[in-house]
Interface confidence: low
């Protein structure tokens, strides 16, 4: 199973719980495959 930073982020894309920054900046989280070290 993938449990790295980017995998977790990828799985949680679409959930506001990932980071307060998502809400503050009014970004709509989308699963765009944002995977990086």
């Amino acid at each position: 199973a993938c449990d790295t930073a980017t995998c977790v982020t990828h799985r949680l894309a679409g959930l506001l719980s990932r980071s307060g920054g998502v809400v503050k900046n009014n970004f709509v989280p989308t699963n765009v495959g944002s995977k990086a070290f």
Partner: antibody, heavy 122, light 107 residues
């Protein structure tokens, strides 16, 4: 302006200890997952350790080569990251970089410091 | 541990030419691959993430492709400032790993 500034490097004898710091500014530090990555002189990049964001319980992961010897930690109030290095070996000699990562859904942010040199030698 | 093997070790080309760098993973990493550029005395700079996404401010001449175990970084027309060392990395499994690097030098 975004900045990551590492400090604390220097010359240490084998078996000794050193504590590296990484001071962050210009971004919401607590949201970021941060790693230490090292580079031995003339060699490639090697991941050392990672600490997750405050909302992810600041969970940590380590490379096998440093497990039990190095400890990564963060102080979000001070916008700082640390790497406590104990039982240092000659093979730990490297430039140590802190590298931050954050995904806000539409894209990512990735910042690196300029590095601090650690030399382990007698 | 996932091993990333980059080829060639050194690539000698002239400005204006096309560069193709390869990165092969020992296990499937889906698209959890990034590419970095590093110049002497500098920190690595992220170019590509998610195998094919250009990072902020990276020129369009840089592109990434691949999935599974085979990945490619292409520089369509080399500029003088592109001559550097390039590393691929994977963030699919701990430990994160990097390739050994490809040195892109001026012919």
């Amino acid at each position: 302006e975004v900045q990551l500034v590492e400090s604390g490097g220097g010359l240490v004898q084998p078996g000794g200890s050193l504590r590296l710091s990484c001071a962050a500014s210009g971004f919401t530090f607590s949201n970021y997952w941060i790693s230490w990555v090292r580079q031995a002189p003339g060699k490639g990049l090697e991941w050392v350790a990672e600490i997750r964001s405050e909302s992810d319980a600041s969970a940590t992961h380590y490379a096998e080569a440093v497990k039990g010897r190095f400890t990564i930690s963060r102080d979000n109030a001070k916008n700082s990251l640390y790497l406590q290095m104990n039982s240092l070996r000659a093979e730990d000699t490297a430039v140590y970089y802190c590298a931050s990562y954050f995904d806000y859904g539409l894209a990512i942010q990735n910042y690196w410091g300029q590095g601090t040199l650690v030399t382990v030698s007698s | 541990e996932i091993v990333l093997t980059q080829s060639p070790a050194t690539l000698s080309l002239s400005p204006g030419e096309r560069a193709t760098l390869s990165c092969k993973a020992s296990k499937r990493v889906t698209t959890y691959v990034s590419w970095y550029q590093q110049k002497p005395g500098q920190a690595p700079r992220l170019l590509i993430y998610g195998a094919s996404n250009r990072y902020l401010g990276i020129p369009a001449r840089f592109s990434g492709s691949g999935s599974g175990t085979d990945f490619t970084l292409t520089i369509s027309s080399l500029e003088p400032e592109d001559f550097a060392v390039y590393y691929c990395s994977q963030s699919y499994n701990y430990p994160y790993t990097f390739g050994q690097g490809t040195k892109l030098e001026i012919k």
